[in-house]
Each structure stands twice: as structure tokens, then as C-alpha cells.
Amino acid sequence: MHVAQPAVVLASSRGIASFVCEYASPGKATEVRVTVLRQADSQVTEVCAATYMMGNELTFLDDSICTGTSSGNQVNLTIQGLRAMDTGLYICKVELMYPPPYYLGIGNGTQIYVIDPEPCPDSD
Amino acid sequence: MHVAQPAVVLASSRGIASFVCEYASPGKATEVRVTVLRQADSQVTEVCAATYMMGNELTFLDDSICTGTSSGNQVNLTIQGLRAMDTGLYICKVELMYPPPYYLGIGNGTQIYVIDPEPCPDSD
């Protein structure tokens, strides 16, 4: 299953990055799982994941750094709290969980660049 | 003539970006001209240029946004005063001006990403 996502995204100076993950659904899935993976330093780690029912809200865990909304076959993902050290390739993984058959799609990744802001001068 | 430069550079939150432009000189040039070009929005513009004698300092015009140093076949370039709107592909062009023969080398470009900082809160 084909998954599309932008090649590059710049995090804002507040450490927030948003991108769209779009999948070409071969069937009429009602339950979809979206996972964001980060690849950096020869390592792949799970950033966040959410399972949602088509037409419903996308819900991540309370302590997740991700938020998102879904619209049809598009998922709008936002990752917050990013620091320069979090720069890396963020890969969108989409699984159509129900009904069968199960489908898996993995995007090419979005390179997210993060620049730490200069600290503001102390107010006297 | 082959010219090497990094693929991507992030400007600091102060709007400063530095990168190395290295050329494989086919001869013993004594006079070298380095030009930084920016390609964005279907347009190529000259950002800055400097001609230097090998072994001497690299001198840009006083009002230039570029500074640089040279060491052998390497030129260390710094561009300052960058804003988000200056994001683009910065291409290093090297010309061996003297003695003949003339040689031209053009790098593949360095994508410089610039993020405008959040303004600091007013101090009361």
C-alpha cells in the first residue's frame, strides 16, 4: 500500500513540526493504525502511534508528543517539543487493521530539521 | 573542474549559515574567484563574490552578507543576516582566473534552511 509524505519539513522555532501522511487505501478500512517512526544514527525508534476508527478523531496517548487529525485517507500529524537533537527522518507507517485483509504501508520518511532557539535575554 | 559542497545546512537561529566549498584544482592557480549563487523560485541570483590570490585572505565587499577564509583548495563561507524567506539552494561557483587556462567549476548546491526565531517577550 502506497503512503505519501513530504520529503522535508522544518520545525518552527517553538519546536513544532507538522506534516500530512496520505495513504492509498485498497479497500474500505474502518480501523486504521498510524505509527510515526524516527530513523537516526542507524536506529529506528517509535515516536508515537494511534489507532482510530474511520470518521473518528485520531487519539494519541496523553503523554504523547504527537497530535493529529484524520480526513479520509489523509492524516495530519503534529509533533511538538522538538529540539535540535531530534532532527532526523520521521517515517509514517499505516496499517489497515479491520476488516481483513490487513494492509501495511510505509512512507519514504520526512526529514525534520530542528534548530534550537537562542535564549531570550534576562529581563532586568 | 569538480566542486564539492554539503547537501544541506541549517542556519543558526541568528540567521548565520556556514559551509565549505572545496574544488579539485587541475593546475596551480594563483587567482581564484568564488561566487555564491542562490537558486529559488525559478530564479538564480548572485549572493556574493570574491576574488583572492592563493595564500591571501578572501575579501568580500564591505556591504556583503558573506565572509570567508581560504585554505588551499578549500573555501570556508559564512552567510549572515538570513531570514526564512532566504531559504534556498546556495551554489558555489569557482573560477580559476590566473594563470591560463581558465577553469570553471560549479557545485551541486547547498540547501540552506532558515527558520525565523520567535520574538522574545517584552521585558516589563
Partner: nanobody
Framework: QVQLQESGGGSVQAGGTLRLSCAVS????????MGWFRQAPGKEREGVAA????????AYADSVKGRFTISQDNAKNTVYLQMNSLKPEDTAMYYC??????????????????????WGQGTQVTVSS
Amino acid sequence: QVQLQESGGGSVQAGGTLRLSCAVSGVTYSPHCMGWFRQAPGKEREGVAAIYNGGGSTAYADSVKGRFTISQDNAKNTVYLQMNSLKPEDTAMYYCGAGSPRFCASATMTGGHHLFGYWGQGTQVTVSS
């Protein structure tokens, strides 16, 4: 040393044709990109057409699409610009330049000439109405 020599310019009436040639010598690097540029008095040099010798892909300025054709003869080390349906606004000095294949498509951008070099002396094209 890379040297480029243009020829084939001249004076023609509007609607006429010309074929410009650029003889290339001393090119030791391959692949490369060859471009045709023009410069009218008091104006910036602008890219007209470019061709990549590694695969024959071409790029044209919007103002000449469908009228001009760039081609090359690798055996003769020559690049041509066939100019048909010439207009008075095509009047300019025409130059060929060599550049990096990565920026072949950039030749026709505003300021694209900055990415080329090894300029020849040029050949004058004058189109009268």
C-alpha cells in the same frame, strides 16, 4: 582549455530562419551541459535553450518554445540552435556557454547564465520587421 566559438548569425526579416553553430573544443569533462544565451543592449543575458549531452534532454525559454530547436553533433563537437519564425524581439547577441549537467534545466531561469561559463565571443542576430 575549453573554448567555444559561435557562428551563423546575421540579419533576416521577421518570419525568417537562422541556424547558429557553437564549435566546442578542449572539453575534457563529460557529461556536460551546453546552453544558448542571448543579450540585448542594456539587458541581462538570458537563457534561450540548453541541452545535456549525457542524454539529449533539452530545456527552452517560454519565449522560444516551438520556434527554436537546440541539437548537438557529438562527432563534430558542435551545438546548434535552429531558429525559425524569427521575431524582431529575438534581436540580440547570441552566446553559447558550458555548464554543469545538474543545472541544465536552470539555464532558462532568470539569472541562469550565472551557472554557465567558457563564453565565446558571440554572434549577432538582427531581425527586422
